[in-house]
């Protein structure tokens, strides 16, 4: 049995006012420095407390930064997309993307080509809508006797 | 386990050169922020130098400026702070500190003490 771990990828603008000691969070990533396999996006590595990050309270460690005020991250050297968040300006707006782990249990060997994984939600929904249609049909039949 | 271990401390004499050493287990220091900062017996600890993830930036307190250099070796995992022209008041426990990424708020011209999570357990340096 292997375990699985199933993410569900959403996306956030964020819209930042650079506080007094700045924005508040750092960054690992680039093009010289790809910190997760296979891509050189720009990541979220630490939030600082009390910052405006921080206080603002959505952006994530671990969060991946798409752009900011619009400037697309691809592509860039870390101490290039380091300079960009910091002349940024005082209103910065982020682009970013969220990895939010939905499943994670044990599961039987997967073959080639199968499907990696459902996320729980799409399960639950008809479980339950079946669920209901089933008690529904249930006090119908009950009614009827 | 994440670990950070200080070396080379020791008695000098005024004029004198050390070279400490921090060599980290269990992670990787190309991704880190590290520094040095030193506590004088009765003082507060305070900022030495710090070097960024990618080596491009660097920052020296006043009192040491043109004395000591920082420098990394990421095949080592190892952090160095080379101490020429010590003085007596460079008598401290010297510490090694990371954090993981770089801030995206200024260049190390801080290297505040709270901007890093992960400490060495220090060395002494004693100047006469």
């Known amino acids: 049995m292997n375990g699985r771990v199933d993410y569900l990828v959403t996306e956030e603008e964020i819209n930042l006012t650079r506080g007094p000691s700045g924005l508040g969070f750092n960054i690992v990533g680039g093009t010289d420095q790809q910190y997760v396999s296979n891509d050189s996006g720009i990541y979220v590595s630490r939030i600082k407390e009390n910052g405006a990050a921080a206080l603002d309270g959505r952006l994530q460690e671990g969060d991946k930064i798409l752009s900011v005020n619009g400037q697309d991250l691809k592509n860039l050297l870390h101490q290039d997309a380091v300079d960009l968040f910091r002349n940024a300006g005082y209103a910065v707006s982020l682009r970013v993307q969220h990895r939010l782990q939905v499943q994670n249990g044990p599961i039987g060997h997967r073959g080639e080509g199968d499907p990696s994984g459902i996320p729980i939600f799409m399960v639950l929904v008809p479980v339950f809508a079946l669920t209901m249609v089933a008690a529904w049909a249930f006090m119908r039949y009950r009614q009827q006797l | 386990d994440v670990q950070l271990v200080e070396s080379g401390g020791g008695l000098v004499q005024a004029g004198g050169s050390l070279r400490l050493s921090c060599a980290a287990s269990?992670?990787?220091?190309?991704?880190?922020?590290i520094g040095w900062f030193r506590q004088a017996p009765g003082k507060e600890r305070e900022g030495v130098s710090c070097i960024d993830s990618s080596g491009g930036s660097t920052f020296y307190a006043d009192s040491v400026k043109g004395r000591f250099t920082i420098s990394r070796d990421n095949a080592k995992n190892t952090l160095y702070l080379q101490m020429n022209s010590l003085k007596p008041e460079d008598t401290a426990v010297y510490y090694c500190a990371a954090v993981l990424g770089d801030s995206v708020d200024y260049g190390m011209g801080y290297c505040n003490l709270d901007e890093y999570d992960y400490w060495g357990q220090g060395t002494q340096v004693t100047v006469s």
């Open positions: 269990g992670f990787t220091l190309d991704y880190y922020g």
